[in-house]
Interface confidence: medium
């Protein structure tokens, strides 16, 4: 019998250029008579154009919703009712070709053509894109608050904020032909629930979404987004009601930046330069294509690419890469944003060099990508260290910490976290190396103590990049480096002339002169430690709640002992900058460190002095008794302490602690405490210092109070941010 044909709605969006009309400001106001009159004419023309082609039989509805420059650009959508079996045949490309063919056929025709009665449509300026019913609904919901802006070359246009009576607004942005638009979004409030979506076309087409941002992101307080061309749309959806705009939007046209380069690398190891997507740190644009050709001076070397918070992964099957596609020597890899460093090592087998391509495969983009490039020795990629094949990084080997996710850096160690005697491979405690007393059979622990040695896990790297054998030589009163750099920056770590943490005792004035109290509205929230004249270090999780993210809330007290009273040695500061570690992850507590820049430098006194920062190679030996200090609760769930408490805790081997916490302990963590519990940090101690005394009498910062199960519970140690694991970031910020 007769079976009705199944019809489906196919939605298209697009724009066309009218050559015999000019854009005027009246056309930006939907309520103006000019807008109403122009849309009526344009709509009639659009319908006539479509129905003049064989698409006419499928025509359902259409709408012109906006105008722009060029001389006059009309933005529209239309719906065709198509038999289901023809759906794929009428792709946007086919529909565009049919409409262009129709326009071209009448360009030189003298016959009266209805759609040409008023408008001279440019066939080359017609664009047809795929859309959906959902896209049209999203567009219609913004039309009560629709703003069109044209931004000229060399201009930076600050966009007017949204209409807070509306629930959704759309900024339709256009720039000069052949340029690309760069949108800058700056969040101005600490917390909000507003959502902003940026599109690579004039309307909110889901398939052309560049990115969407939500809720006053602290991770990205400023976001710069590039369109692939001169048109862009930004849609705002209201969050919580607010009289203040939680963001500032500005837009500017920029020229296309070529992303192609030919480089010849020098005959040296380490980083030699940087490659980045155009306008880094802006988000890369939806049609980015970069091609970098690097020539390596010799086959002894391989090429290393060092990424920051971005990794390359093999993509199973042939799925598109959602965070950038890379091709390196014909290998296809997908980019992936991660909260870790990563290196891609490319073995070089021919002198022709290496070509690296980066492409944004889909319209959805992300933060610009930057990569440091350099050479490594193919026969010894990590001198004195271990090459972690999982992430391409060189990590310390046999130091008692599994730095590589697969733990291979701690496998097959003859001597773990100890010194291996040359003579018979016996292992001796690190403090016994270069201490003036031979402990190895033929005294190999005391050899080469006055000269440079190859750099390794426990060697100290001097400023001139040479290494010394003596472990932990910093600030011990004896210059070990040729350039004396091990004895520089040593005005630290000394206690003042001093006369609760769970299981602790009260501290005296000047006993812990680096201890900081971080307060909000007069209430102690977290501990911290002074590490430089204008910098205090603390835990990132202290700022986890959006309401705690603003610098203006915080006051830092130094030289304090009692919470409920002040004494002459105590000083307070406002915070001018707050920096969380870029890899900090709230759920895992990884990289739990933050730096606060004080509004003015400290004046050092007996009660206010910085603690010493360890070098990356500094070894804090398990079993060592160190100290934690703070005003935290004296018992689990209790109130904070009035007096600054101190307690000694023992450093715990990493794998023992990792076992207790079911392998949630990362290489950036360090454990301390006792199996019996009792002595531990507690709520309110977070961010406070774990310090260990060196033989020189100076105190070094080993950790920051981070997390743990309860307080002082048997079998559960306190977990601290391992300072040696984040020291390079600290030094980069502070210096």
């Amino acid at each position: 019998g007769y079976k009705a044909e199944v019809m489906v709605s196919q939605v298209y969006s697009g724009s066309l250029r009218v050559l015999n009309r000019h854009f005027s400001q009246d056309l930006t106001r939907r309520e103006s008579s000019a807008f109403r009159s122009e849309t009526a004419k344009a709509q009639k023309m659009l319908k006539e154009l479509i129905t003049s082609t064989r698409l006419g039989t499928y025509y359902n509805s259409s709408s012109v919703y906006s105008f722009g420059e060029g001389p006059l650009t009309c933005f529209f959508w239309f719906i065709l009712q198509i038999p289901e079996h023809r759906r794929l045949m009428l792709s946007p490309e086919v529909v565009q070709a049919l409409l262009v063919e129709e326009l071209l056929s009448t360009v030189n025709s003298s016959a009266a053509v209805p759609y040409r009665a008023e408008y001279e449509v440019d066939p080359e300026g017609l664009v047809i894109l795929e859309a959906s019913v959902k896209d049209i609904a999203a567009l219609n919901s913004t039309l009560g608050c629709y703003r069109y802006s044209y931004v000229g070359q060399g201009q930076v246009l600050r966009l007017k904020g949204p209409d807070h009576l509306a629930s959704s607004c759309l900024w339709h942005l256009q720039g000069p032909k052949d340029l690309m638009l760069k949108l800058r979004l700056e969040w101005t409030l600490a917390e909000c629930r507003d959502r902003l979506a940026m599109y690579d076309v004039a309307g909110p087409l889901e398939k052309r979404l560049i990115t969407s941002v939500y809720g006053c992101s602290r991770q990205e307080p400023v976001v710069e987004v590039l369109a692939s061309g001169a048109i862009m749309a930004v849609v705002w959806k209201k969050g919580l009601h607010s009289y203040y705009d939680p963001f500032v939007l500005s837009v500017q046209p920029v020229v296309f930046q070529a992303c192609e380069v030919n480089l010849t690398l020098d005959n040296r190891l380490d980083s030699q330069g940087v490659l980045s997507t155009p306008y880094f740190p802006s988000y890369y644009s939806p049609q980015t294509h970069c091609s970098w050709h690097l020539t390596v001076p010799s086959l002894d070397y391989g090429l290393a690419l060092w990424f920051d918070a971005y990794a390359l992964r093999r993509q199973k099957y042939d799925l598109p890469c959602t965070q950038g596609q890379w091709t390196i020597q014909n290998r296809r890899l997908c980019g992936l944003r991660i909260l870790q460093p990563y290196a891609e090592r490319i073995p070089v087998v021919a002198t022709a060099g290496i070509t690296i391509n980066f492409t944004s495969q889909i319209s959805l983009t992300g933060p610009g990508v930057r990569v440091h490039y350099g050479l490594y020795n193919q026969s010894d990629p990590c001198p004195g260290e271990f090459l972690c094949s999982v992430n391409g990084l060189c990590v310390p080997a046999c130091d008692g910490v599994k730095d590589c996710p697969n733990g291979l850096d701690e496998r097959n160690c003859v001597c773990r976290a100890t010194f291996q005697c040359k003579e018979d491979s016996t292992c001796i405690s690190l403090p016994k190396v270069c201490d003036g007393q031979p402990d190895c059979l033929n005294g190999s622990d005391e050899e080469q103590c006055q000269e440079g040695v190859p750099c390794g896990t426990f060697t100290f790297q001097c400023e001139d990049r040479s290494c010394v054998k003596k472990p932990n030589p910093q600030c011990d009163g004896r210059p070990d480096c040729r350039d004396g750099s091990d004895e520089e920056h040593c005005d630290c770590g000394l206690q003042g002339p001093s006369s609760r943490i769970v299981g602790g005792a009260v501290s005296s004035e000047g006993e812990w002169p680096w201890q900081a109290s971080l307060q909000v509205r007069g209430r102690h929230i977290c501990g911290g430690a002074l590490i430089a004249d204008r910098w205090v270090i603390t835990a990132a999780h202290c700022f986890q709640e959006d309401s705690m993210a603003s610098t203006v809330l915080w006051t830092v007290f130094l030289g304090k002992v009692w919470q409920n009273s002040r004494w002459p040695g105590e000083v307070s500061f406002k915070v001018s900058r707050l920096l969380l570690h870029p890899y900090h992850e709230e759920d895992s507590h990884d990289y739990d460190v933050a730096l606060l820049q004080l509004d003015h430098p400290v004046v050092r006194s007996a009660a206010v002095r910085p603690v010493c920062l360890p070098a990356r190679s500094h070894f804090f030996e398990p079993g060592l008794h160190c100290w934690i200090t703070g005003w935290g609760a004296l018992r689990e769930g209790g109130p904070i302490s009035n007096a600054l408490q101190k307690v000694d805790v023992q450093l715990i081997p990493q794998d023992l602690c990792s076992e207790v916490y079911r392998y949630q302990v990362t290489p950036r963590m360090l454990c301390a405490g006792y199996r019996k519990g009792k002595k531990d940090a507690c709520q309110g101690d977070s961010g406070g210092p774990l310090v260990c005394k060196a033989l020189s009498g100076r105190w070094f910062l080993a950790g920051l109070v981070s997390w743990g199960l309860g307080c002082g519970r048997p079998n559960y140690f306190g977990v601290y941010t391992r300072i040696t694991g984040v020291i390079s970031w600290i030094q980069q910020v502070v210096t």
């Epitope: 008692g400 976290a417 016994k432 398990p622 079993g623 023992q650 794998d655 023992l656 006792y674």
Partner: antibody
């Protein structure tokens, strides 16, 4: 100075029980574990178990489970180890030793010889 | 339980000699290993803990090394008072276990 003073030698018949005491001085017993280790003549050291004097929590080696009981009286800084159902192979010197949390046993008592003989 | 194996069972040496005693754990004990000295009729005395840390009051001729499963006690220059039995013990997890001992005798 730190000292652990143990009770005197005992001679017991098979099937009987023995209770050895260990009195601490020079430190707070509640800050440490008290471990019990035994050594049969000419043999090595064997860990029997330990008690946390602060809360009385105990941990025993599987071999002694059900036969050993460790108790304490913090008011007199004393820990006790009672071993029941004695057999001739329990003849040994019994030592108490303190340990701080994760560290090994740093101070030991002088030992108490327990002889099990019919 | 973690088994501790010491070698050799006994060793003969002279005053001034360098002596090495080894201890192997049946599983990884990180650096949680101690060495004790025991003389006839006396209680054991702690020499080394955490594999390499010298207990206060112990002469520096005693040193410990190793990590994981293999450990060494070294006496760099034997003195007459060093002739005794030496035990290793893991303090990584309970039940704590000892090696069977190494008797150091005068040659």
């Amino acid at each position: 100075q730190v000292q652990l003073q143990q009770s005197g030698a005992e001679v017991k018949k098979p099937g009987a029980s023995v209770k050895v005491s260990c009195t601490a001085s020079g430190f707070n017993i509640e800050d440490y574990y008290i471990n019990w280790v035994r050594q049969a003549t000419g043999q090595g050291l064997e860990w029997m178990g330990r008690i946390d004097p602060e809360d009385g929590e105990t941990g025993y080696a599987q071999k002694f489970q059900g036969r050993v009981t460790m108790t304490r009286n913090t008011s007199i800084s004393t820990a006790y180890m009672e071993l029941s159902s004695l057999r001739s192979e329990d003849t040994a010197v019994y030592y108490c030793a303190r340990s701080i949390y994760l560290d090994p046993m740093d101070y030991w008592g002088q030992g108490t010889l327990v002889t099990v003989s019919s | 339980d973690i088994q501790m194996t010491q070698s050799p069972k006994s060793v003969s040496a002279s005053v001034g000699d360098r002596v090495t005693i080894t201890c192997r754990a049946s599983q990884d004990v990180t650096t949680a290993l101690a060495w004790y000295q025991q003389k006839p009729g006396q209680s054991p005395k702690l020499l080394i803990y955490w594999a390499t840390s010298l207990q206060s009051g112990v002469p520096s001729r005693f040193s410990g090394s190793g990590s994981g499963t293999d450990f060494t006690l070294t006496i760099s220059s034997l003195q007459p008072e060093d002739f005794a039995t030496y035990y290793c013990q893991q303090h990584y997890s309970t039940p704590y276990t000892f090696g069977q001992g190494t008797k150091l005798e005068i040659k």
